[in-house]
Interface confidence: medium
């Protein structure tokens, strides 16, 4: 009874099409399959960036599979065929590894790179982002931005720079059709007369940066004699009312601070009959049911009311 | 509560200029841009410009051919509009009006300012 | 100049029925996925009152039988039901572009 053996999967590299971090893993069925024919061949492949703890496994019947790395450190990739345990009649077939390495070879040391680069996707409409120029770099130094998500047919570069004196040190994005909810990659790379610069790589998916625009026209309504109800718009622009948290802090008679966090545009406060001026801002978020994370909006206009009794029924109209 | 206060009618003779002022209170003056809306006697409304107090830019309708001029003094949340060269078609109420922004409209208006321009 | 027209210059409408006020731009006032498009109501004697902003968004304080609908060049008010309170004029104004223009009114009158 022999042992039935498979080769590992030939050819297997992995290939940079230029996407600035999303990467293709490629590689041809294995030799001598003609004893398998009737049987379909699986390829169990692992991944990771050189330094990670853990691999991705995926397991495929494909001769490709595409994913996103961090180009700032390598990549390596094994890969072996699978016979399931239909074509042994018996227990699953497994070849050795076929293993490949991918890197970038970094130019200039590491000071060189953009430090502290923040980018901020305002109102989700507007991407910008910024950077401060490498420790020690000169004048003549400049860096470039460039970028790519899926749906684009190429990396793009940056065609509105922010300035300072005359090294780039941002960029304000066009508008960037169906961008949100992938994955969305950058590098910064740069040029000197003087000294190699080294590039940087980031990766992020829009929705998660998202700054909104403060919330608008707040107003005061007596509900009861010991309640207050206050409420205010959403901003304009192309966020859902479903996808803001608020935070609300309020202000009575200069002393009393509230706090609070809320999901919908109004919030009921219980006051007293002596009190005699309330004010109030509000800020927003993106929620945890439209991005994994966000940032707070500016606060809001402060809206007060002081110097006449709060029992009036409407007290903004 | 949000007020815009305007000061009191005026009457004018043709070629002779008007300074109308807005006192604006409740509110961050310069926070919302503040624009001028003039209308004739059973007319329409029309816009006559704004000016961001915050950074003093301004913004003109041009059919008024420089003849209108928008200010502002934030030490005391104040706007001022000033039309020179008056004619007896400028005979009108002249509003004030704050916005939050370009897209949202002007959500409190001044009492409004008769100027009667008349020989 | 984006030239606005509102139609009709006078609608006589009984209490309790249904308003539509239409408005008209000589050009597309949306931009950024919004419409510059606003609505106000003028009583004699009083300024006016910013009823709907960006097309569809209720001012503050705004009952919710006033509504507002449209995008590029074509935009309607409506009135669901209407009160006594609600017979005056309307206008509707852009501010896509500088010079912020109106249009020339809807007299909403007692039927």
């Known amino acids: 009874d022999t042992e039935i053996k498979v080769n590992p999967p030939q050819d297997f590299e992995i290939v940079d099409p230029g996407y600035l971090g999303y990467l293709y893993l490629q590689w041809q069925p294995p030799l001598s399959l003609d004893h398998f024919k009737e049987c379909t061949v699986e390829y169990e492949l692992k991944y990771r960036n050189i330094g990670s703890e853990t691999w991705k496994t995926i397991i495929t019947k494909n001769l490709h599979y595409k994913d996103g790395f961090d180009l700032n450190k390598g990549i390596e990739a094994k890969i072996h065929t699978l016979l399931p345990w239909q074509c042994t009649n018996g227990s699953e077939v497994q070849s050795s590894w076929a293993e490949t390495t991918y890197w970038i070879s970094p130019q200039g040391i590491p000071e060189t790179k953009v430090q502290d680069m923040d980018c901020v996707y305002y109102n989700w409409q507007y991407l910008l982002c910024s950077w401060k120029p490498g420790i020690g770099v000169l004048l003549d130094t400049n860096y470039n931005l460039f970028y790519w998500y899926e749906g684009l047919d190429h990396a793009l570069q940056c065609v509105d720079y922010i300035k300072a004196d005359g090294q780039n040190i941002g960029c304000r994005f066009p508008y960037l059709e169906a961008s949100d909810y992938k994955d969305f990659y950058i590098c910064v790379n740069g040029s000197s007369e003087n000294k190699p610069i080294r590039s940087s790589y980031f990766t992020f998916q829009l929705q998660n940066i998202v700054k909104p625009l403060p919330p608008v026209y707040l107003t005061f309504t007596r509900e009861s004699s010991c309640e207050i109800k206050l409420k205010w718009s959403i901003p304009l622009g192309p966020i859902p009312a479903r996808c803001f948290d608020y935070e609300i802090e309020i202000r009575e008679d200069d002393t009393t601070l509230v706090t609070a966090t809320v999901e919908n545009e109004t919030y009921t406060l219980k006051t007293t009959n002596e009190t005699r001026q309330l004010c109030f801002v509000v800020r927003s978020k993106v929620n945890i049911y439209c991005s994994d994370d966000g940032i707070w909006s500016e606060w809001s206009d402060k809206q007060c009311w002081e110097g006449e009794d709060l029992s009036k029924k409407t007290l903004l109209r | 509560q949000v007020q815009l206060v305007q000061s009191g009618a005026e009457v004018k003779k043709p070629g002779a200029s008007v300074k109308v002022s807005c006192k604006a209170s409740?509110?961050?003056?310069?926070?919302?841009?503040m624009n001028w809306v003039r209308q004739a006697t059973g007319q329409g409304l029309e816009w006559m410009g704004r000016?961001?107090?915050?950074?003093?830019?301004?913004d003109y309708n041009q059919n008024f051919k420089d003849r209108v001029t928008i200010t502002r003094n934030t030490s005391i949340s104040t706007a001022y509009m000033e039309l020179s060269s008056l004619r007896s078609e400028d005979t009108a109420v002249y509003y004030c009006?704050?916005?939050?922004?370009?897209?949202?409209?002007?959500?409190?208006w001044g009492q409004g300012t008769l100027v009667t321009v008349s020989s | 100049e984006i030239v606005m027209t509102q139609s009709p210059a006078t609608l006589s409408v009984s209490p309790g029925e249904r308003a539509t006020l239409s408005c008209r731009a000589s050009?597309?006032?949306?931009?950024?996925?919004?419409?510059?498009m606003n609505w106000y109501q003028q009583k004699p004697g009083q300024a006016p009152r910013l009823l709907i902003y960006?097309?569809?968004r209720q001012g503050s304080g705004i009952p919710a039988r006033f509504s507002g609908s449209g995008s590029g060049t074509e935009f309607t008010l409506t009135i669901s039901s209407l009160q006594s309170e609600d017979f005056a004029v309307y206008y509707c104004?852009?501010?896509?572009?500088?010079?912020?223009?109106f249009g020339g009114g809807t007299k909403l009158e007692i039927k």
């Open positions: 009006a704050r916005g939050y922004g370009t897209a949202y409209g002007v959500d409190y």
């Open positions: 409740g509110y961050t003056f310069s926070n919302y841009l």
């Open positions: 000016i961001d107090p915050y950074d003093g830019d301004i």
């Open positions: 050009e597309s006032v949306d931009n950024y996925g919004i419409s510059f």
């Open positions: 960006a097309a569809s």
């Open positions: 104004q852009q501010s896509k572009e500088v010079p912020w223009t």
